[in-house]
Interface confidence: low
């Protein structure tokens, strides 16, 4: 007789990732009865909310609803009518609200207050809303990877062979950055973590992992975009800033009151005799380079090695997992290959950024200007922050992997997440062995 | 190659206005800044103010603030300098200038037009 | 504004090295790159760029001409004065809109 498959016994999760920038909503998917097994739970839709982040609603947050709703209906378009009630819904705000909530408690409550009204109006079972702190951020973005590469997982993997193998079960490091804030996770060689703050302990699947960590709050791309004008214009002397991290040609006005909006730039703050200055741009690399590294206090360290800011960073150990947007910007850059060493990265950067705007904006014409207009400066931003913050060298820079998607999930924290609040990462290894992905009879 | 060809010489009564204008040929004026610059007879140079054509944003140099406005028409390729309540002293050539990259070598002038204030 | 200030005019015997100076109020560097330009004018003519970003030589202009200096004090060098030459100089920066120096005559001697 014929082979039937039984009907499939499958479970769904819901993540928002409310970004400085935008929101994202991931959809997960998995086998009921192997909820415990290690690399099981795959991504099936990723959609991305049509606006900026939610911190950006503080003054209209009646908007919030409206704002939330396409994805949401997405969601309810997705997962079958049936498994809507059991399925779990989480809310990760991240470095767009804890920098909103320094400045105002009050009204980042009031953000997430309408957000979790919003979400408790959908048929799934809300799991509530809540900003994470940059330390999650950083564990459940390194979960992620190393259950995507099957890392915890000492068994014969049902999975095709992941990307980036490397035939030990050495798990990878995490490099995540966004808008806001840039996490840097790993399991260090043999090395006290110097600092307590960074240092995190995990039994997963009966082995036990001591994993550094640390959020810097402010470094993400746009965050330490404003954070370098606002240091420039300090010297500036009138509404004119030259910035070498725009290409030759660029023009764009900025607002001071918009560049003293954030925290980030409270340090630089100074009354200006002017409302308003205008970034020329004239695409020098190096020069760029300089400028930025600038924002990298690198005198002062109380411990035996650091990054900067005066933050402890162990020795770097192992292959590392570069995601979000250190992979969004290098993609566009087409700089993620294996093959493409330190200094041709470094080589590609000095003639992207010397390009003139009218010749850039010509070869990408499909590209929004405001994003297009600040890949030489995010580029050159990455390089900096590998190379002088975290202390990548031009022959580790090779265990650096640019990474989208693992086995079609996104690389980022919202796996980790939801495995962890699902309790999907059991302490101790299963004793069931895997099976295929659905029962034949 | 990029020409600035500016209009012709003019003569004024004290406390009128002038409209002096600058057409560019050879490339678009969007790709630039446009400047003006003043020279009184037997005198230095002067900055005036320039536009950003691309975005129609100004900058004037103190001295001309109140009295200076200049213009951009990207249909024709054209930009214009107007100097109100002009007295003696205005009396002055005029040139254009562009200026591509800040402090870069993309530098044309026009020509320069007379503009003689006198009652 | 940055005010400029120029040496004054000078006579110099052809096949001679002339030297002018311009010094500037504040610094006209930014990130390593200097907005310093030097100009000639003959009568009746518009200006003539001749030195670009401080020392950088505009394109069909002699090489006996040459520029140097950074921050506040700049020179423009004419190392064998041709009688071609005479005309009055100007340093302009562009760091912050355009501002000129108060020109230099050079005339032979």
């Known amino acids: 007789t014929q082979n039937k498959a039984l009907p499939e016994n499958v479970k769904y999760g819901i993540v928002l990732d409310a970004g400085s920038s935008h929101t994202s909503l991931y959809i997960y998917k998995w086998p009921a009865e192997k909820e415990n097994d290690t690399g099981v739970v795959h991504q099936v839709e990723e959609c991305r909310v049509k606006g900026p982040g939610i911190s950006k609603f503080v003054q209209k947050v009646n908007e919030i609803g409206i704002y939330l709703t396409d994805c949401m209906e997405r969601a309810r378009e997705v997962i079958p009518r049936s498994q809507h009630q059991e399925t779990p819904v989480y809310l990760g705000a991240t470095a767009g609200m804890r920098l909103l909530r320094m400045e105002s408690e009050e009204l980042a409550d009031r953000v997430l207050d309408v957000v979790e009204r919003s979400l408790s109006n959908y048929p799934f079972d809300f799991q509530g809303a809540r900003i994470i702190t940059g330390q999650e951020e950083g564990a459940y973005g390194w979960i992620t990877i190393n259950y995507l590469l099957g890392k915890f997982s000492q068994k014969t993997r049902w999975f095709s062979i992941v990307p980036y193998e490397t035939n030990n079960q050495e798990t990878f490091g995490a490099l995540d950055l966004g808008g806001a804030s840039t996490q840097v996770t790993f399991v260090p060689q043999n090395q006290t973590i110097e600092s307590p703050d960074n240092a995190l302990q995990f039994r997963l699947y009966g082995k036990d992992y001591n994993v550094y960590t640390h959020s810097f709050l402010c470094y993400g791309k746009d965050q330490a975009l404003w954070q370098k004008l606002a240091k420039d214009i300090q010297v500036a002397s009138n509404e004119i800033l030259r910035d070498p991290c725009f290409h030759p040609g660029y023009k764009k006005v900025v607002n001071v009151s918009d560049l003293y909006k954030t925290p980030c730039t409270k340090r630089f703050e100074m009354t200006l005799p002017f409302q308003q200055f205008e970034i020329q741009g004239i695409g020098n690399y190096q020069q760029c380079h300089q400028s930025i590294l600038e924002l990298f206090n690198t005198s002062y360290c109380p411990y035996s090695q650091c990054a900067f800011n005066g933050i402890f960073l162990p020795p770097l150990q192992g292959d590392f997992g570069a995601f979000s947007a250190f992979y969004f910007v290098m993609k566009f850059l087409n700089l993620t290959s294996e093959k493409v060493s330190q200094e041709k990265v470094t080589e590609m950067m000095k003639k992207f950024c010397a390009q003139p705007w009218e010749e850039i904006k010509t070869s990408y014409a499909g590209v929004k200007e405001k994003y297009l207009s600040e890949y030489c400066f995010s580029g050159t931003y990455i390089l900096s922050l590998l190379l002088q913050g975290y202390h990548f060298t031009a022959d580790s820079w090779e265990h650096i992997h640019f990474i989208g998607k693992i086995q079609g999930s996104d690389a980022g924290w919202t796996l980790g997440y939801m495995l962890n609040l699902t309790n999907m990462i059991p302490a101790e290894q299963p004793l069931s062995t895997p099976l295929s992905h659905s029962t034949y009879v | 190659e990029v020409q600035l060809v500016q209009s012709g010489a003019e003569v004024k009564k004290p406390g009128a206005t002038v409209k002096i204008s600058c057409k560019v040929s050879?490339?678009?004026?969007?790709?630039?800044?446009m400047h003006w610059v003043q020279q009184a007879p037997g005198k230095g140079l002067e900055w005036m103010g320039r536009i950003d054509p691309d975005h129609e944003r100004t900058k004037y140099a103190e001295k001309f603030k109140n009295r200076v406005t200049i213009t951009a028409d990207t249909s024709t390729n054209t930009v214009y300098m107007e100097l109100s309540s002009l007295r003696s002293e205005d009396t002055a050539v005029y040139y254009c200038?562009?200026?591509?990259?800040?402090?870069?070598?993309?530098?044309?002038w026009g020509q320069g037009v007379m503009v003689t204030v006198s009652s | 504004d940055i005010v400029m200030t120029q040496s004054p005019d000078l006579a110099v015997s052809l096949g001679e090295r002339a030297t002018i100076n311009c010094r500037t109020q504040?610094?006209?560097?930014?990130?390593?790159?200097?907005?310093m330009n030097w100009y000639q004018q003959k009568p009746g003519q518009p200006p003539k760029l001749l030195i670009y970003?401080?020392?950088s030589l505009a394109s069909g202009v002699p090489d006996r001409f040459s520029g140097s200096g950074s921050g506040t004090d700049f020179t423009l060098t004419i190392s064998s004065l041709q009688a071609e030459d005479v005309a009055v100089y100007y340093c302009q920066q562009s760091r912050n809109l355009w501002t000129f120096g108060g020109g230099t005559k050079v005339e032979i001697k």
């Open positions: 970003l401080a020392s």
């Open positions: 200038a562009t200026e591509r990259v800040p402090g870069f070598e993309t530098d044309y």
């Open positions: 050879g490339d678009s004026i969007t790709a630039y800044f």
């Open positions: 504040q610094t006209v560097d930014h990130y390593g790159t200097t907005y």
